[in-house]
Amino acid sequence: VPRWRQQWSGPGTTKRFPETVLARCVKYTEIHPEMRHVDCQSVWDAFKGAFISKHPCNITEEDYQPLMKLGTQTVPCNKILLWSRIKDLAHQFTQVQRDMFTLEDTLLGYLADDLTWCGEFNTSKINYQSCPDWRKDCSNNPVSVFWKTVSRRFAEAACDVVHVMLNGSRSKIFDKNSTFGSVEVHNLQPEKVQTLEAWVIHGGREDSRDLCQDPTIKELESIISKRNIQFSCKNIYRPDKFLQCVKNPEDSSCTSEI
C-alpha cells in the first residue's frame, strides 16, 4: 500500500465491487420485470460518480442524486416493512410475504446490501484497503450517506400502516441512533401514515415478557405520537412459528398467539 494513502479505521471496499453492483442490477431487472427498463451500465456509472475522486469524509446526499433518479421505483406505499437490528428475519419475511417490501427489496437497497465502498480524493481509484468508520472516522462517508439517503426516501414514500420489525434480544430494542431511529422515524409523513406498528421479535424460547412495555418502546411510542402518527405494538414470541404461519396461514396451530 502506498504510504500516501489515507488509512481509515473501517474495512475497505468489498472486493469486485463494480462487478458485484452490475451483476446485482442485472439480476434485479430479471427478478423484477417491472424494472427491466433500467439501464444497469448507467446505474453503475451514477453509483461510481457519487464517490469516485471525492474525499470519503465529504460525501453529501446531493452526490447520490443521479443514482436516486435512475433507481426511482414505485413500491406499494402501504406494504412497507422497516427493520432495526434484525435484517435477516425481515428479509425472510418479505421473501415469503411477497407483497411486502423492505428497503433491500428495492433496486437501490438490493444493489448495496452488505457492501462497503469508498474512493480517494482526486484519484479515480476505488480504495480496497480501508474506508472510513462511522464512529472512528466520519459520518459523511459514502456508505453511511447512501443508506441515509435511501432510507429517508423509503420512509417518505410510506403510507397507511407502516410495520417495523425490532430485535427484542437487544438491550435497546428501539435505538435512537439506528438508521430506523435517526432517519426513518423522522421521515414518516404524518399526512400519509396513519399507524406505525412495531413487531418486537423475541429471542429466547421461554421468553414470555411483554416487550411492548420496554422503556425504549415507550420512547418510540412517544416520538411517533408527537408526530401525530398512531402507534401499536405486537410481541412475536416465536419467530420461527411466525414465519411458518406466514407461509401456511391455514395451519391449525396458527390461530394461537405467536
Partner: antibody, heavy 115, light 107 residues
C-alpha cells in the same frame, strides 16, 4: 455502436430443431438481459423468454417451456435460442433484443418449418 | 397470463392528425407498459417505456399515459414517417405480453 447480429434464415422439417444465434457488440454483454421475441407472418409479437448472460439464468414463456433453450457464451458475446419439435406454426421471424431504456434488436432470423 | 387488448386494430389518418391508440390490460400492471413502432420488414423500435417516458431520440409528438389497466399512446401531429404498426407491451409480470397491434395507414 451497439449491434446485435443474428444468424441467417433456416428451413426446417416438422419435428426438427433450430438454433438461432445473436452476436452482440458495442456494449458489455453481461450488463443487460437478452430477450427473444418471435413474429409469425402477418401476426403480432410474442415473447419467448430471456437470458441473463452474466449468470446464465433464464425465464421462459410457459407456452414454450420444454421446447426452447436459451444459452449465452460470454467469451464470444453470443446468445442462442434453440427450439425443438418444430411444427408449421413455429414459422416466424425470431428476434433477439437487448433490454434497457434504449433497447437494440437484432435484424431477425426467418425460420420456416415445412415438410 | 396478462392479456393486452389494443384498439383499434387499424385506423386511417392524414398527416397532421392527432392519433390515439389504447391498450387495456386484463389485470393491474402499474405503469409497466411500453409502446413499440414497427415498419414492414424491420424490427420493432421502442417509443415509450414506463407508460410515459420517451426512449432516446423519440420525437416529442409521441406521448404515453395511463396506469393500472388502461393505457394510451398519442401522436399529437401525425408525420409521414409515422405510418406503421404500433404495439403495446406489459412488463409488470412474466410472461411479457404484447397487444395485437394497431396499423396506422394513410387516409
Amino acid at each position: 455502436q451497439v449491434q446485435l447480429v443474428q444468424s441467417g434464415a433456416e428451413v426446417k422439417k416438422p419435428g426438427a430443431s433450430v438454433k438461432v444465434s445473436c452476436k452482440a457488440s458495442g456494449y458489455t454483454f453481461t450488463n443487460y438481459l437478452i430477450d427473444w421475441v418471435r413474429q409469425a407472418p402477418g401476426q403480432g409479437l410474442e415473447w419467448i423468454g430471456l437470458i441473463n448472460p452474466g449468470s446464465g439464468s433464464t425465464k421462459y414463456n410457459e407456452k414454450f417451456k420444454g421446447r426452447v433453450t436459451l444459452t449465452a457464451d460470454k467469451s464470444t458475446s453470443t446468445a442462442y435460442m434453440e427450439l425443438s419439435s418444430l411444427r408449421s406454426e413455429d414459422t416466424a421471424v425470431y428476434y433477439c433484443a437487448k433490454t434497457g431504456t434504449l433497447p437494440y434488436w437484432g435484424q431477425g432470423t426467418l425460420v420456416t418449418v415445412s415438410s | 397470463d396478462i392479456q393486452m387488448t389494443q384498439s383499434p386494430s387499424s385506423l386511417s389518418a392524414s398527416v397532421g392528425d392527432r392519433v390515439t391508440i389504447t391498450c387495456k390490460a386484463s389485470q393491474n400492471v402499474g405503469t409497466s407498459v411500453a409502446w413499440y413502432q414497427q415498419k414492414p420488414g424491420k424490427a420493432p423500435k421502442l417509443l415509450i417505456y414506463s407508460t410515459s417516458y420517451r426512449s432516446s431520440g423519440v420525437p416529442s409528438r409521441f406521448s404515453g399515459s395511463g396506469s393500472g389497466t388502461d393505457f394510451t399512446l398519442t401522436i399529437s401531429s401525425l408525420q409521414p414517417e409515422d405510418f406503421a404498426t404500433y404495439y403495446c407491451q406489459q412488463y409488470g409480470s412474466y410472461p411479457l405480453t404484447f397487444g395485437q397491434g394497431t396499423k396506422v395507414e394513410i387516409k
